[in-house]
């Protein structure tokens, strides 16, 4: 049978040939009659055999990391017979490991982020080195990690490569650290190989700083002409934190006048002082307010850093502006009776210069031929007024400073023209009536009504009467309905178209004014040719014809 021990060859042997071991048949008596042969991948190129003795040699340097075993076949032949002495057999040559590979960090570059002020023991990152040597061969691939740079803030667990915080760090003092980790194989024993890696550790910000005003006093100015909402200046606090943790909100802590407000520009982190109410130099020419600033986001557990908000004082000076005249009232309403003579007093407007120099004021009326105004603001009429033409006048009164004619103010003045009873009542329309020849006494000929151009004080009341002459003629009579209408009735029976084709009745209409005014109004009554039945249809037709200017036969 075959005789051999297990074959090992150390890797990286530099000798030209290295004895691996010996293959032999137990039938070999050493008389050189047997020939040994080596077959398989590596036979002749990597390994050779001494044909006489069966000694195997490695003739090239081997790398266990490349290939750790070779399976070869062995034959032994009797030279004298040429026959196999033993059956062909497989055997294994194992390449044994030496510590020829240093640990390598394959996942480089390492970068970690950890919050500032993290407590001791906080895990930062785990680094892992690989060693190509055989982990089952002694300590060639057993690694120990150590810290070459990074004390006293960091530590590394020797067997795991876990980096932890060993001392609190403040990002505002230093925001990143380079830590150098060494991995040593052979668990750090003599002859160990090592590799290093750098770890960039960045501190992320926590909100451990409150915003603080660098200035304890700000001086701002505002023009008294500035409208509400005007930005009058900015204030700024500084926060050593970054990002969201440096976002801040400004607010007013003290402002008795409630004249100002502060809004925050979240892009620039500035406080913008805003005018909330208009200021008046003549009323108050300076203000003092106190502003405070706080972070926008504060976690509950970080409140200890934010107990007292930073404050600053803001002095605001109001700048005087030459302001236009100011009327005592925003508008005026005056009354004047119609028909008063020209030059009559209407009313007085009054404007003053709000500024300290108190410029005299001149007044004018824009586009009016009816009214005049003097330098005292007294408005008078330039013509007699007729309410029935215009009951109201809308005037625009302008006040101009004498010393600065560009300073102008205008206000509306409304003049109401009051009524006097200067118009008598009259027919509300033109009346043309008719009566049939065969009309009986008491027949209603026409209902009439009146109008009065005057304004009714309470309510118009009209009184209707026939003139004295018509009363005496007695062909027609009038009845006042007491409701501003009256009816005309026949006062006899029968009319004659040929004898009297038309009647003109004078009607007096009086109003209830003081004094009462009366007018005389003429009512025309046509006598119509009606049929025997007195059909109004025919009369209506004829009346229609008459009214249209046709003569009926």
């Amino acid at each position: 049978g075959w005789v051999w021990n297990q074959f090992f060859v150390p890797e990286e042997m530099n000798t030209t040939s290295h004895h691996v071991g010996r293959l032999r048949s137990d039938l070999d008596n050493g008389n050189n009659s047997f020939q040994y042969k080596l077959l398989g991948a590596g036979a002749g190129s990597t390994f050779i055999i001494d044909e006489r003795t069966g000694d195997i040699y490695a003739i090239e340097k081997l790398d266990r990391e490349e290939r750790s075993l070779y399976i070869l076949r062995a034959q032994v032949i009797d030279i004298t017979t040429g026959r196999a002495v033993e059956p062909e057999s497989e055997f294994v040559i194992k390449v044994s490991d030496i510590n020829d590979n240093e640990p390598k960090f394959l996942d480089e570059p390492y970068e970690a982020i950890v919050p500032e002020m993290s407590p001791e023991g906080t895990l930062v990152i785990q680094v892992t080195a690989s060693d190509a040597d055989d982990p089952s061969s002694g300590n060639n691939a057993r690694l120990l990690y150590s810290l070459l740079q990074g004390q006293p803030y960091f530590s590394v667990e020797p067997t795991t490569g876990v980096i932890r915080i060993s001392s609190k760090m403040d990002r505002e003092l230093q925001d990143e650290y380079w830590v150098i980790i060494q991995a040593k194989d052979m668990i750090g024993q003599p002859g160990a190989l090592s590799g290093t890696t750098s770890v960039l550790i960045k501190l992320s910000d926590v909100n451990d700083n409150k915003p603080i005003f660098k200035e304890s006093l700000y001086r701002l100015t505002v023009s008294e002409s500035a409208p509400t909402g005007t930005s009058i200046g900015t204030i700024m606090a500084y926060d050593n934190d970054i990002g969201e943790n440096a976002e801040m909100d400004y607010s007013i802590e003290e402002d008795d006048s409630q004249t100002f407000d502060i809004i925050t520009n979240h892009e620039t982190q500035e406080g913008i002082v805003i005018l909330k109410k208009k200021v008046n130099f003549e009323h108050q020419n300076h203000y003092g307010i106190r502003a405070k600033v706080k972070n926008h986001h504060v976690d509950e557990q970080l409140m200890k850093y934010h107990t007292e908000a930073s404050t600053t004082f803001i002095k605001i000076q109001v700048e005087d502006v030459d302001e236009p005249p100011l009327f005592l009232l925003p508008y005026y309403i005056f009354e004047i009776f119609e028909e008063t003579p020209q030059g009559s007093f209407v009313g007085v407007v009054s404007a003053t210069d709000p500024d300290n120099r108190k410029s005299p004021i001149r007044y004018s009326i824009t586009r009016s031929k009816v009214f005049n105004i003097d330098d005292n603001g007294t408005i008078t009429t330039t013509n007699s007024l007729d309410r029935e033409i215009s009951a109201w006048y809308n005037l625009s009164i302008t006040a101009t400073e004498k010393y600065n004619i560009e300073q102008i103010s205008s206000i509306p003045v409304y003049v109401q023209v009051l009524n006097i009873n200067d118009h008598a009542p009259e027919f509300s329309q033109y009346y043309e009536s008719y009566v049939c020849e065969n009309a009986g006494s008491g027949q209603v000929i026409q209902t009439i009504s009146a109008v009065d151009r005057d304004e009714s004080i309470e309510e118009h009341h009209f009184y209707f009467n026939l003139s004295v002459e018509d009363t005496n003629s007695s062909s027609f009579t009038i009845i006042d309905n007491q409701d501003n209408t009256a009816v005309i009735l026949t006062n006899r029976t029968g009319f004659n178209l040929q004898e009297e084709p038309i009647f003109y009745i004078s009607i007096l209409i009086a109003d209830n004014g003081i004094p009462s005014l009366t007018s005389t109004n003429t009512l025309t009554i046509h006598v119509c040719d009606c049929d025997d039945s007195g059909s109004t249809q025919t009369c209506q037709y004829q009346e229609l014809m008459l009214s249209m200017g046709f003569k009926t036969e």
């Epitope: 077959l39 398989g40 036979a43 790398d63 490349e66 075993l69 062909e88």
Partner: antibody
Framework: QVQLQESGPGLVKPSQTLSLTCTVS??????????WSWIRQHPGKGLEWIGY???????YYNPSLKSRVTISVDTSKNQFSLKLSSVTAADTAVYYC????????????WGQGTLVTVSS | EIVLTQSPGTLSLSPGERATLSCRAS???????LAWYQQKPGQAPRLLIY???NRATGIPDRFSGSGSGTDFTLTISRLEPEDFAVYYC?????????FGGGTKLEIK
């Protein structure tokens, strides 16, 4: 898991040099215990081993192609490459890259292959 | 170099049948150094069996390998439609590394 992807020109002129690259993903080319190999397959024919390389640079070639073949490795890019010089129409084939278990010699995994045609 | 001869060149069978594919080496090959691959049209070969009899990851147990020395066999116990492909054997026992010519397994 490890994946391989061949890349390079699909057409090469006769007498020129064929150049292909295999990119390894999902694992490191610098791992011990593996060779990185090229194999080709002529149209409708069987498989022919061209050669392989260990990441440290040691190469093994098929004697029938040895004079024309160069295999190289770029560990920083996780790639290995094939150059076959003085090509003829007989070199028209699908070229595969594959990982080889160095102790036992089987190929796994393989790239999907790339057809290279040698023609003027 | 070791020449691997596969037989038959083409094998026509029906789904459900048993397939036996042979690979003969011109020299003895260590059983640790023989592998089998499956290749479908337009695809790369896929490792089926390594070390003569070990199934690769994800390979169904209907595939099995055996043999030693110069004679090796791949057996598919019950053919499935997806098993019809070309099968190659490959050796690593001697340089250069070589493949067999392949057996085409087609549907009858």
């Amino acid at each position: 898991q490890v994946q391989l992807q061949e890349s390079g020109p699909g057409l090469v002129k006769p007498s020129q040099t064929l150049s292909l690259t295999c990119t390894v993903s999902g694992g490191s080319i610098s791992s011990g215990g593996y060779y990185w190999s090229w194999i080709r397959q002529h149209p409708g024919k069987g498989l022919e081993w061209i050669g392989y390389i260990f990441y440290r640079g040691r190469t093994y070639y098929n004697p029938s192609l040895k004079s024309r073949v160069t295999i190289s490795v770029d560990t920083s890019k996780n790639q290995f490459s094939l150059k076959l010089s003085s090509v003829t129409a007989a070199d028209t084939a699908v070229y595969y890259c594959a990982r080889v278990y160095s102790n036992y010699g089987w190929f796994d995994p393989w790239g999907q292959g790339t057809l290279v045609t040698v023609s003027s | 170099e070791i020449v691997l001869t596969q037989s038959p060149g083409t094998l026509s069978l029906s789904p459900g049948e048993r397939a036996t594919l042979s690979c003969r080496a011109s020299q003895s090959v260590s059983s640790s150094y023989l592998a089998w691959y499956q290749q479908k049209p337009g695809q790369a070969p896929r490792l089926l069996i390594y070390g003569t009899s070990n199934r690769a990851t994800g390979i169904p147990d209907r595939f099995s390998g055996s043999g030693s020395g110069t004679d090796f066999t791949l057996t598919i116990s019950r053919l499935e439609p997806e098993d019809f492909a070309v099968y190659y054997c490959q050796q690593y026992g001697s340089s250069p590394l070589t493949f067999g010519g392949g057996t085409k397994l087609e549907i009858k």
